[in-house]
């Protein structure tokens, strides 16, 4: 990723060519989350629907065990939306009581696990303070960007609090990736 | 979409091939909305600019009567942003009066209509409670994801309240799709 | 961009063909911003990391002096996220004092500069009123859409207040573009 590759400007046909319909692609949709133990100081990962309704995986892009598996090296567009919902945030309760008003927050992270690095790599993070005064609040966090991924890399979506994720509709909370 | 298609790993050239510049694509931008009757319990659809300024449709992707028409089957990336703006939300007024504080909300839905299927399909939803204390508030909701669409499918953007949509600038509220 | 181009429906192989891996692409990540003078009534532009960590430019897409340079004409998907963070917004202080409560706001604009055109073009804008009651607030604004760009066009990201941009992590604030 360090430098810049200059393709000869006169060359219009490149190799190998491949049909776009054969590229690895996946769109995963939310399901009800089963509470699981997760490591302290590590956000829990969501699990997903991969074949019912709007969800699909194709062309060797596989979903298993909360991970999307990258089947070939290349540049991928990776995206997710998580819709959160909750009751009045603690921060407003604390504020009313005159205590320090550090806000609650909601966070989504798209994480890459790779064989060559012992730490997961955070590709994308959306984080938002929540200081809602109303008793019921809800809001989405959307993320999307392009990354150079390697065959065998694994992608997952982690959230700050799995109990706040809106799992009621497949169009509200989702996760996808496709080879460009 | 149910299973996984395994492409032979030795095969580098796939068919049919096609130049990327010939794929159906559209980027539509906001225009002032004319108030229209819409069915109760059904969010109204926005209409769009399709050829002036930043807006365009190309390669058989057509816009007509609030709908983007999908001209060929395949996987599409579909996106929209709607910027909303309003005065103090009811929820804060209600709260001040000591009445139940169910929050106001703003919602965007990208909907697919298929002639062969009686019910529209909600592809994407962004929904947010609005409990702003300031007298004037404004905020965007962004959506984007990949879907397998069929020739003849129609896409539209629905919103919870058409009167709150910021139609003043083409860069604030938009809708697009492109074949991958 | 005005009309619609109809490709012959019987023709499956188009020209010129090119391998997707050879297309111009960039993903830039946030760095600490150096305070710079900017014109009154003009939002300052961010500068970016283009080769370390997750950041890269490839296939003649170059980054220089806050700009992404478009090396060939075509349809590009352009995206950015900016995470903002700050202390209690003025609007809540003003509100408490009973003065007019015009809200603070945070804004991101992706701007195109074309040498042959005197005025920059705003491609995308995300703008949000900030009326947070908590003492510390943070939130992202995400933008992404497709545009027809010309060889030589330059893209930049402008923000309403550079001092509010969270530059601490490459996954929180980023900017990218790729030829479709």
């Amino acid at each position: 990723l360090k430098g810049q590759e200059f393709a000869p400007s006169h060359q219009q046909v490149y190799a190998p060519l491949r049909a776009d319909g054969d590229k690895p692609r996946a769109h995963l949709t939310v399901v009800r989350q089963t509470p699981t133990q997760h490591l302290k100081n590590q956000f829990p990962a969501l699990h997903w629907e991969h074949e019912l309704g709007l969800a699909f995986t194709k062309n060797r892009m596989n979903y298993t065990n909360k991970f999307l598996l990258i089947p070939e090296s290349g540049d991928y567009f990776v995206y997710s939306q998580v819709t959160f919902r909750g009751m009045t945030s603690e921060c407003s309760e604390i504020r009313q009581a005159g205590r320090p008003n550090k806000p609650d927050s909601i966070t989504v992270v798209i994480t890459k696990v790779t064989d060559s690095y012992p730490e997961p790599t955070q590709l994308l993070m959306g984080t938002k303070s929540v200081c809602e005064v109303g008793s019921n609040w809800f809001q989405p966090i959307y993320l999307g960007a392009m990354f150079s991924l390697q065959e065998g890399d694994k992608l997952m979506v982690n959230v700050s609090d799995i109990s706040l994720v809106d799992y009621t509709k497949e169009d509200k909370t989702f996760f996808g990736a496709f080879l460009l | 979409l149910k299973g996984q298609e395994f492409a032979p790993s030795h095969q580098q050239v796939y068919a049919p091939l096609r130049a990327d510049g010939d794929k159906p694509r559209a980027h539509l931008t906001v225009v002032r909305q004319t108030p229209t009757q819409h069915l109760k319990n059904q969010f109204p659809a926005l209409h769009w600019e399709h050829e002036l300024g930043l807006a365009f449709t190309k390669n058989r992707m057509n816009y007509t009567n609030k709908f983007l028409l999908i001209p060929e089957s395949g996987d599409y990336f579909v996106y929209s942003q709607v910027t909303f703006r309003g005065m103090t939300s009811e929820c804060s007024e209600i709260r001040q009066a000591g009445r139940p504080n169910k929050p106001d909300s703003i919602t965007v839905v990208i909907t697919k209509v298929t002639d062969s299927y009686p019910e529209p399909t909600q592809l994407l939803m962004g929904t947010k409670s609005v409990c702003e204390v300031g007298s004037n508030w404004f905020q965007p909701i962004y959506l984007g994801a990949m879907f397998s669409l069929q020739e003849g499918d129609k896409l539209m953007v629905n919103v919870s309240d058409i009167s709150l949509v910021d139609y003043t600038k083409e860069d604030k509220t938009f809708f697009g799709a492109f074949l991958l | 961009l005005k009309g619609q181009e109809f490709a012959p429906s019987h023709q499956q192989v188009y020209a010129p063909l090119r391998a997707d891996g050879d297309k111009p692409r960039a993903h830039l990540t946030v760095v600490r911003q150096t305070p710079t003078q900017h014109l009154k009534n003009q939002f300052p532009a961010l500068h970016w990391e283009h080769e370390l960590g997750l950041a890269f430019t490839k296939n003649r897409m170059n980054y220089t002096n806050k700009f992404l340079l478009i090396p060939e004409s075509g349809d590009y998907f352009v995206y950015s996220q900016v995470t903002f963070r700050g202390m209690t917004s003025e609007c809540s202080e003003i509100r408490q004092a009973g003065r007019p409560n015009k809200p603070d706001s945070i804004t991101v604009v992706i701007t195109k500069v074309t040498d042959s055109y005197p005025e920059p073009t705003q491609l995308l804008m995300g703008t949000k009123s900030v009326c947070e009651v908590g003492s510390n607030w943070f939130q992202p604004i995400y933008l992404g859409a497709m545009f027809s760009l010309q060889e030589g066009d330059k893209l930049m990201v402008n923000v309403s207040d550079i001092s509010l941009v969270d530059y601490t992590k490459e996954d929180k604030t980023f900017f990218g573009a790729f030829l479709l």
Epitope: K2, F67, L69, V113, D115, Y117, G152 | - | -
Partner: antibody
Framework: QVQLQESGPGLVRPSQTLSLTCTVS????????MHWVRQRPGRGLEWMGR????????KYNPSLKSRVTITRDTSKNQVSLRLSSVTAADTAVYYC?????????WGQGSLVTVSS | DIQMTQSPSSLSASVGDRVTITCRAS?????MYWYQQKPGKAPKLLIY???NLASGVPSRFSGSGSGTDFTFTISSLQPEDIATYYC?????????FGQGTKVEIK
């Protein structure tokens, strides 16, 4: 706790196939990557290859690629190494290693001698 | 292959001494890893990503460098640090190790 245990015959005849199994416990193998690394007597460490257990994707050291195969059986929490056409130069301690998203963990190693 | 050249191949130092080992890659790598191997034992990860201390590793161990030149340091040598130390790059295929540096107490 996390454990990796290599097992297999300590003696293999020249030209035969060396087979080792690594049985893991204390973690979900599908969330990681499993490697084989060997250390020949008095020599340094040599990476042989790895498998991504969830999808089965493999990468091999090109110098061994024609002879090495790594497979996994997730139902048994096992990863296997096969090295064909062995010679005395393949005498080594063979280590099973976990990586990816978690601290590296190495097995205690399995000494394999190639001799007739 | 990316060749890893480690130096010195062996060194002898006193308890409390600062010990430095270098590793040079034949081409630039983003991340470097350092392992400790005691006789008859499996290697143990000490440093990852050139400079990050692995969990449970004493703070007297550190790493630095980028590109092709990397350094591993023991700020104050302890008797239990007697071992062979290896650098490794994980980026190119194959992953390659340095030839090792044997550290002894004077």
């Amino acid at each position: 706790q996390v454990q990796l245990q290599e097992s297999g015959p300590g003696l293999v005849r020249p030209s035969q196939t060396l087979s080792l199994t690594c049985t893991v416990s204390g973690f979900d193998m599908q969330s990681t990557y499993m490697h084989w690394v060997r250390q020949r007597p008095g020599r340094g460490l040599e990476w042989m290859g790895r498998i991504e257990p969830a999808g089965g994707h493999t990468k091999y050291n090109p110098s061994l690629k024609s002879r090495v195969t790594i497979t996994r059986d997730t139902s048994k929490n096992q990863v296997s190494l096969r090295l064909s056409s062995v010679t005395a130069a393949d005498t080594a301690v063979y280590y099973c290693v976990r990586s990816g998203g978690l601290p590296d963990v190495w097995g205690q190693g399995s000494l394999v001698t190639v001799s007739s | 292959d990316i060749q890893m050249t480690q130096s010195p191949s062996s060194l002898s130092a006193s308890v409390g001494d600062r010990v430095t080992i270098t590793c040079r890659a034949s081409q630039g790598v983003e991340y470097m890893y350092w392992y400790q191997q005691k006789p008859g034992k499996a290697p143990k990860l000490l440093i990852y990503g050139a400079s990050n201390l692995a969990s449970g590793v004493p703070s007297r161990f550190s790493g630095s460098g980028s590109g092709t030149d990397f350094t591993f340091t023991i700020s104050s040598l302890q008797p239990e640090d007697i071992a062979t130390y290896y650098c490794q790059q994980w980026e190119g295929n194959p992953r390659t190790f340095g030839q090792g540096t044997k550290v002894e107490i004077k």
